[in-house]
Interface confidence: low
């Protein structure tokens, strides 16, 4: 029996856009003003969001779908949706508690967001350090000494430089 | 009172299936949109999939699309979430979570959803 009502319910013809009106008989109505549903059959539509402050337009509110917000310059995106948006740093620096720090000796960071981390250890690769490392770039490995024949020269171009914990694809 | 309880929760091997309910009471649970999140030791709260009141629309995280599937009987007050192909970094415990009827926020944020559910753990290991 249930089945049956379901099937037979008045706002299951409700397309997205509207919402289904109990108080004028079950009647298909516009969503409001500021309002979607992006999906048929919606008992209420549901309010945009609104970007405000941080927060700028990505995407126009329609009667179907929501706004989408992005971050204004110099912050960025955090969380599904960007329902968060956290300042940019500089290459080099990472955002704590106490703002933008420069990355310890050892660790760096190329990009305006996330933390900062170790310098990849070549040896571990059983290379050498082509190129050392700094704040904003991670160390560049190269060829092993024993790799090099008297006379070779070292303009072999170097390994990339893989992030830690990742392996080789 | 509202009141949301999941069960189904487990050990398993990778590649294998939960089904994981939820049943809800103190409220018509056929008016409101539904969810699963999960959260793993150590990380943030992640949604997994929404289902409309009516079941006419459903959204899933990309890493669980092809692989979960969440349902709902709304004469029992249940939600469902299936979970085959199972891997390890599908553990976490699992929040069914009910989305409010207004909302601001993007339909895969937190703040969507007033009423949640205590959880249910999902390990996932060999």
């Known amino acids: 029996f249930e089945r049956t009502r379901s099937l037979q319910d008045p706002c299951s013809n409700c397309p997205a856009g509207t919402f289904c009106d109990n108080n004028r008989n079950q009647i298909c109505s516009p969503c409001p003003p500021n309002s979607f549903s992006s999906a048929g059959g919606q008992r209420t539509c549901d309010i945009c969001r609104q970007c405000k402050g941080v927060f700028r337009t990505r995407k126009e509110c329609s009667s179907t779908s929501n706004a989408e917000c992005d971050c204004t310059p110099g912050f960025h995106c955090l969380g599904a949706g960007c329902s968060m948006c956290e300042q940019d740093c500089k290459q080099g620096q990472e955002l704590t508690k106490k703002g933008c720090k420069d990355c310890c000796f050892g660790t760096f960071n190329d990009q305006k967001r996330g933390i900062c981390r170790p310098w990849t250890n070549c040896s571990l690769d059983g290379k050498s350090v082509l190129v050392n490392g700094t704040k904003e770039r991670d160390v560049v490995c190269g060829p092993s000494p024993a790799d090099l024949s008297p006379g070779a020269s070292s303009v072999t171009p170097p390994a990339p430089a893989r992030e830690p914990g990742h392996s080789p694809q | 009172e509202v009141q949301l309880l999941e069960s189904g929760g487990g050990e398993v091997q990778p590649g294998g299936s939960l089904r994981l309910s939820c049943a809800a009471s103190?409220?018509?649970?056929?008016?409101?949109?539904m969810a699963w999140f999960r959260q793993a030791p150590g990380k943030e709260r992640e949604f997994v999939s929404r289902l409309a009141w009516n079941g006419g629309s459903t959204d899933y995280v990309e890493s669980v699309k092809g692989r979960f599937t969440i349902s709902r009987d709304n004469p029992k007050n249940t939600l469902y979430l299936q979970m085959s192909s199972l891997r390890a970094e599908d553990t976490a415990v699992y929040y069914c979570?009910?989305?409010?009827?207004?909302?601001?926020?993007?339909?895969?944020?937190?703040?969507?959803?007033?009423?949640w559910g205590q959880g249910t753990l999902v390990t996932v290991k060999p």
């Open positions: 979570a009910r989305q409010r009827s207004y909302s601001r926020y993007d339909i895969r944020t937190p703040q969507t959803y007033d009423y």
């Open positions: 103190g409220w018509a649970f056929g008016n409101y949109g």
